[in-house]
Interface confidence: low
């Protein structure tokens, strides 16, 4: 039976915040989240004709139906899931750092390893187009993750959000069970943008509803006059739409979807830059650990040779061509580029009535062989998850005690 769950600290928290400061750091309620950023940067006639659905997901091609398995990034023999990436040379140093920190967070918490592109068939290309958007799951070939400079101004949260899409995850607030936990205020939504709130029909949600998921949109998403479009039902004051880090549930979902465990053989360090890269990636690839070290070394001493302390050559930008190559196809996101994007995940349909384009993406279940239901005598005996509320997971899984404004601490 649904009831709100507030994350709490067992033991001492490794991170604390001054009173009144949310874990989003500088992100106040007035700061722009993904929908607002994209509305400001991408000029479209109508949501129906847009190449984006739900505000930041590249509309999947109706011509490419992939199986659930092929939509996941493949796991290597060592239990590590490698996602090759190219990082555009157009990013300045601070922007690159923000992106790399987000990639590193996945390495710290999950079995996902973002490795530099080395002619792999399937890879993501992270480029500063107009807006923050990506596709859901692995599409095959090159797939675009757009992170405009505005998407990076408030830290790594939006990067994490888009990378969760890349790994195969949809938005929290469009879950099939969302009506138990949030109220969608349809009258407050920008006319024509209601499509962004259509529920998923998938029942494969892996963990209970999580208000603190990095995949949850904020209260004002697609608001027409600054009033909430999303209202949490369980706790009026709970914060939604955090863009700070992966919540505990976000991490659990990644581990469940990919059927893996988080830690590699090396012990995890402390702090935002100390992290384990786990088992080594493919020999040809340069690990994020070394990239971060190299970047740090680069910023400390401008070595003209471009070599890191260990003598390894560092490319002009992590995962990019030394010449800053960028595919001409990326100059504009055309219908063809859109058609390259992944069909969603396969088996239970994610219906999108009124989505405009014929044969709009049918989501497919990520869960191929993973059951989210216990063995029970009746199929009706499904378990109803309780939503998680409160803060996202901070280092060590802790939550600042003062984050629950006006709420009692559990």
């Amino acid at each position: 039976l649904g009831a709100p769950l507030a994350s709490s600290c067992a033991g001492a928290c490794g991170t604390s915040f001054p009173d009144g400061l949310t874990p989003e750091g500088t992100q106040a309620s007035g700061d722009k989240d993904i929908p607002a950023i994209n509305q400001g940067l991408i000029l479209e006639e109508t949501p129906e004709s847009s190449f984006l659905i739900e505000g930041d997901i590249i509309r999947p091609s109706p011509f490419r139906l992939l199986s659930a398995t092929s939509n996941k990034w493949p796991m290597g023999g060592s239990g590590v899931v490698e996602v090759p990436f190219l990082l555009s040379s157009k990013y300045d140093e601070p922007s690159r750092q923000v992106i790399l920190e987000a990639l590193a967070e996945f390495e710290r918490s999950t079995c996902i390893r973002f490795v530099t592109y080395q002619d792999q068939r399937d890879f993501i290309s992270i480029i500063p187009m107009y807006g923050c958007f990506s596709s859901v799951g692995r599409s095959g070939g090159m797939q675009v993750v757009s992170l405009a400079p505005t998407c990076l101004q408030k830290g790594r949260g939006i990067v994490l959000h888009e990378l969760m899409h890349v790994l195969g995850f949809w938005h929290e607030h469009t879950r099939a069970d969302r009506d138990r936990y949030i109220r969608v205020n349809w009258n407050e939504i920008l006319p024509g943008f209601e499509i962004n709130f259509i529920k998923s029909q998938s029942s494969n949600m892996l963990t209970p509803y999580d208000y603190s998921s990095v995949m949850h949109y904020g209260r004002l998403a697609f608001s027409r006059r600054g009033l909430p479009t999303i209202t949490p039902l369980w706790a009026p004051s709970v914060h939604i739409g955090q863009r700070w880090n992966l919540s505990a549930s976000d991490i659990t979902r990644v581990l469940k979807l990919y059927g893996c465990s988080p830690s590699g053989p090396r012990p995890r360090g402390r702090g935002s830059h100390a992290h384990s890269t786990g088992r080594s990636p493919a020999p040809a690839s340069l690990s994020l650990q070394r990239l971060l070290e190299a970047l740090s070394a680069e910023s400390r001493s401008p070595d003209p040779s471009g070599s890191s302390a260990g003598g390894q050559p560092v490319p002009a930008g992590p995962g990019e061509s030394p010449h800053g190559w960028e595919s001409p196809a990326l100059k504009k996101l055309s219908a063809e580029a859109s058609a390259r994007q992944p069909q969603t995940l396969a088996s239970s349909p994610r219906s999108r009535p009124g989505a405009g384009a014929p044969g709009v993406a049918q989501e497919q279940s990520w869960l191929a062989g993973v059951s989210t239901k216990p063995t029970v005598p009746s199929s009706e005996a499904g378990i109803q998850p309780v939503p998680v509320q409160g803060s996202p997971a901070l280092p060590g899984g802790c939550v600042p005690r003062n984050h629950f404004k006006g709420m009692s601490e559990d």
Partner: antibody, heavy 116, light 112 residues
């Protein structure tokens, strides 16, 4: 088959604490939240609260805040409830149940008796 | 908190008779998602409660069709068309729409 095995009866002194356990089987422990209920002798049932096994997040019935603390141990797939500052009012049978849209499965109950 | 009031507290019946138990909530338990999370449980002496009916009128797996639930808003009823010996025990209604979730005080079904 879904089953919930609760720890045995407890006889405790007033003012002390007790920690009772609930170990489910037949489904993945971290997939669903665990709910706890209290039933005093000859009386009705009361909902104490729920815990999310993934991250330890909890929600409580206001009446039991400060009295009950819910925890989980993911490594052993076990849920726990600690009751503190016990009085005779806390003498009851305590049940755990996975958090379904309805309580399809219950533990057998743990009898806690508070007596000097 | 939502108060769940059951009537009667005790219901003496003869085997084969029809039995009817009423449950009234202090406020509507229609959830904002359109569902009414009203359940009925039977508890026999020395046992844990067993689910009979969920969401007002849905029989749980394995529950005989002589049990039926009805109602809406604040008034709900459990009917047993022909009482059998195994039906004896205490019946509880329960609302799961508003936190904290609450049970009724119980109705004891006993042989007349």
């Amino acid at each position: 088959e879904v089953q919930l095995q609760q720890s045995g009866p407890e006889l405790v002194k007033p003012g002390s604490s007790v920690k009772i356990s609930c170990k489910p089987s037949g489904y993945t422990f971290t997939d669903y939240n665990m709910v706890w209920m209290k039933q005093s002798h000859g009386k009705s049932l009361e909902w104490i609260g729920a815990i999310n096994p993934n991250n330890g997040g909890t929600t409580y019935n206001q009446k039991f805040k400060g009295k009950a603390t819910l925890t989980v141990d993911k490594s052993s797939s076990t849920a726990y409830m600690e009751l503190r500052s016990l009085t005779s009012e806390d003498s009851a049978v305590y049940y755990c149940a996975p958090n379904w849209d309805w309580f399809a499965y219950w533990g057998q109950g743990t009898l806690v008796t508070v007596s000097a | 908190d939502v108060l769940m009031t059951q009537i009667p507290l005790s219901l003496p019946v003869s085997l084969g008779d029809q039995a009817s138990i009423s449950c009234r909530s202090s406020q509507s338990i229609l959830h904002s998602n359109g569902n009414t999370y009203l359940e009925w449980y039977l508890q026999k002496p020395g046992q844990s409660p067993k689910l009979l009916i969920y969401k007002v009128s849905n029989r749980f797996s394995g529950v005989p069709d002589r049990f039926s639930g009805s109602g809406s808003g604040t008034d709900f009823t459990l009917k047993i068309s022909r009482v059998e010996a195994e039906d004896l025990g205490v019946y509880y209604c329960f609302q799961g729409s508003h936190v904290p979730f609450t049970f009724g005080s119980g109705t004891k079904l006993e042989i007349k």
